[in-house]
Amino acid sequence: TIPPHVQKSVNNDMIVTDNNGAVKFPQLCKFCDVRFSTCDNQKSCMSNCSITSICEKPQEVCVAVWRKNDENITLETVCHDPKLPYHDFILEDAASPKCIMKEKKKPGETFFMCSCSSDECNDNIIFSEEYNTSNPDLLLVIFQ
């Protein structure tokens, strides 16, 4: 629970707690903002981001954004609050332990985004459909 000597709320700046009233600690995410990338036509890629940050807010999750246009490929790694849109998209998969890329419609470029909620989960970005939980073999592995 929140220690009694820690102020619980001032100026609406709440201390985030879990369902049991314990202080919710933030997760760790790769956080290199936008970097050029060589990740292309692969089932999965490592971020090659050397910076692991403690997210600023306990409710934030890890996000990765892969973009390809006529000139270059970039990979963005950040923390972000899933209640807020990112690049105008809702983080639908924020509770996932893995960062499984989903394509989003953006004019003039190929745009994939994923979010996840385990430490440094945006270090390994997954494009392959075989990682989708609709795959019955994967479900079998999960429940064994």
């Epitope: 879990d18 049991n20 314990a22 202080v23 600690f25 760790l28 403690i54």
Partner: nanobody, 122 residues
Framework: EVQLLESGGGLVQPGGSLRLSCAAS???????QMWWVRQAPGKGLEFVS?????????YYANSVRGRFTISRDNSKNTLYLQMNSLRAEDTAVYYC???????????????WGQGTLVTVSS
């Protein structure tokens, strides 16, 4: 009984340095994940730094990266935070905290010290 006792806070000028200590007792210090967490006046908690055990991997918030260094001395049961290039916005009560998984996925036992006040002002 688990106890965490912070020390080393005080008044320092902008650009100055301080070293905080957290003396731990009542548990096996060398096996625990340890954190420094701060609370500025009128603000919520900010999670500044974490050090894991075993391995001693360290992590920082973007706001302190390159200025603060977390370390531990398991033989002395003590956690440290070396704070350099201090700024007015670093003014806060600094707590050390330990986290241990309960065994139930995603849940933890937390223990907190009483905190030490750091004031950065000219």
């Amino acid at each position: 009984e688990v106890q965490l006792l912070e020390s080393g806070g005080g008044l320092v000028q902008p650009g100055g340095s301080l070293r905080l200590s957290c003396a731990a007792s009542g548990f096996t210090f060398g096996t625990e994940q340890m954190w420094w967490v701060r609370q500025a006046p009128g603000k919520g908690l900010e999670f500044v730094s974490r050090i894991d055990s075993p391995g001693g991997r360290t992590y920082y918030a973007n706001s302190v990266r390159g200025r603060f260094t977390i370390s531990r001395d398991n033989s002395k049961n003590t956690l440290y935070l070396q704070m350099n290039s201090l700024r007015a916005e670093d003014t806060a009560v600094y707590y050390c905290a330990k986290r241990r998984p309960t065994g139930v996925s995603g849940t933890f036992y937390d223990y907190w010290g009483q905190g030490t006040l750091v004031t950065v002002s000219s």
